[in-house]
């Protein structure tokens, strides 16, 4: 004969464990079931009743099978230099990420605590490395015969053109000026191509990517001729 | 106010390690690239090692290359430098410097009071 | 790795004399080139940057110049104050050296 199914709440066998998505309660002695995701517990259960469940509030969540009395508050609303990603419902908390030229410079269990600018590369300098989601652009003086004329966070180093005369020849932050008509590229090895990610706290010297400046910040930074731009979002 | 303070420096014998720290407050400790600059008693400063903001590049000068490491925690807001296999000519005052925010703001904008390294049997 | 010459190694002068440091790279370091101040006993302090943009809360006595590989730090008026050591120091590619200082001293 097939064992007998046992309805919540019922006493463990001795040693024995509660089933998926339930719990042992202490004060009752008793696995009871578990509220699942978007509920919490309003009653707990007795020897001879089950687990109460009900809906969370709004701007609250459970993720998980669970038997908390109340249900979690959600984040506060997302920063202005962030864009929600995932929205507060009952199952889920809000999900706050860096908007586009920004980066995660410190990270939270979800989302994000503080979001910074992207560096940006002067003129001379070129992206080495382009920015993620949690890191920085990582800038490098443009080598001999490349250049770059912009301040940005996605330029990277560009080939001087080739002149057949030179009018005024090309530097790290300038190209060639051509009298001709028809100028051409060079192809400089590696100047057209951002090179491959150096392997993490690399030591290297020029020209692999060196550093920069602090990130864009307009408020909360001190002083300092220019410094980084950065924005706190809500715990 | 920025306030940068190193410390762990000292007495060490030739071929020794030691660890400086410094301990960085004031602002957005995770979102600037930082350095040590050395100045040996009575001579002029020198460059000795930069990590960007995110601890993923890495720079050093050649006199140090493969003996120091820089290092930073941006939780805890501190930078350190694990130097090994020290000689003489590493005595110095080290100093904790914010910058350069290389590419973009390339200067040394704050400097910490200077920890004082003594190599010396 | 890119050398800088500074000059000169000291100087004197009285309170009110014009004074002039130089600096020059032995490659173009395209401006990207601080000065900085030291004073006995004391941390360096950015004076310029970029060459030419002074440092928030720094006199307007003080000026940077230059491009390319020839630099130079000018200080108008000089005042008691401004008795110290300077450095020049470049940001272009690895290692970022300094210039051997500028000890300006009282005559």
């Known amino acids: 004969l097939p064992a007998q199914v046992a309805f919540t709440p019922y006493a463990p066998e001795p040693g024995g464990t509660c089933r998926l998505r339930e719990y042992y309660d202490q004060t009752a002695q008793m696995c009871c079931s578990k509220c699942p995701p978007g509920q919490h517990a309003k009653v707990f259960c007795t020897k001879t009743s089950d687990t109460v469940c009900d809906s969370c509030e709004d701007s609250t969540y459970t993720q998980l099978w669970n038997w908390v009395p109340e249900c979690l508050s959600c984040g506060s609303r997302c920063s202005s230099d962030q864009v929600e990603t995932q929205a507060c419902t009952r199952e889920q908390n809000r999900i706050c990420t860096c908007r586009p030229g920004w980066y995660c410079a410190l990270s939270k269990q979800e989302g994000c605590r503080l979001c910074a600018q992207l560096r940006k590369c002067r003129p001379g300098f070129g992206v080495a490395r382009p920015g993620t989601e949690t890191s920085d652009v990582v800038c490098k003086p443009c080598a001999p015969g490349t250049f770059s004329n912009t301040t940005s966070s996605t330029d990277i180093c560009r080939p001087h053109q080739i002149c057949h005369v030179v009018a005024i020849p090309g530097n790290a932050s300038m190209d060639a000026v051509c009298t001709s008509t028809s100028p051409t590229r060079s192809m400089a090895p590696g100047a057209v191509h951002l090179p491959q990610p150096v392997s993490t706290r690399s030591q290297h010297t020029q020209p692999t990517p060196a550093p920069s400046t602090a990130p864009g910040t307009s408020f909360l930074l001190p002083v300092g001729p220019s410094p980084p731009a950065e924005g706190s979002t809500g715990d | 106010e920025v306030q940068l303070v190193e410390s762990g420096g000292g007495l060490v014998q030739p071929g020794g390690s030691l660890r400086l720290s410094c301990a960085a407050s004031g602002f957005a400790f995770s979102t600037y690239d930082l350095s040590w600059v050395r100045q040996a008693p009575g001579k002029g400063l020198e460059w000795v090692a930069y990590?960007?903001?995110?601890?993923?590049?890495?720079y050093y000068s050649d006199t140090v290359k493969g003996r120091f490491t820089i290092s930073r925690d941006n939780a805890k807001n501190s930078l350190y430098l694990q130097m090994n296999s020290l000689r003489a000519e590493d005595t110095a005052v080290y100093y904790c410097?914010?910058?350069?925010?290389?590419?973009?703001?390339?200067?040394?904008?704050?400097w910490g009071q200077g920890t004082l390294v003594t190599v010396s049997s | 790795d890119i050398q800088m010459t500074q000059s000169p190694s000291s100087l004197s002068a009285s309170v009110g004399d014009r004074v002039t440091i130089t600096c020059r790279t032995s490659e173009s370091i395209y401006s990207n080139l601080p000065w900085y101040q030291q004073k006995p006993g004391k941390s360096p302090k950015l004076l310029v940057y970029d060459a030419t943009k002074l440092a928030e809360g720094v006199p307007s006595r003080f000026s940077g110049s230059g491009s390319g590989t020839d630099y130079t730090l000018t200080i108008s008026s000089l005042q008691p104050e401004d008795f110290a050591t300077y450095y020049c120091?470049?940001?272009?590619?690895?290692?970022?050296?300094f210039g051997q200082g500028t000890k300006v001293e009282i005559k």
């Open positions: 120091q470049h940001f272009w590619v690895t290692p970022w050296t």
């Open positions: 410097v914010r910058g350069p925010f290389y590419g973009s703001a390339n200067y040394f904008d704050y």
């Open positions: 990590i960007n903001n995110g601890g993923i590049s890495t």
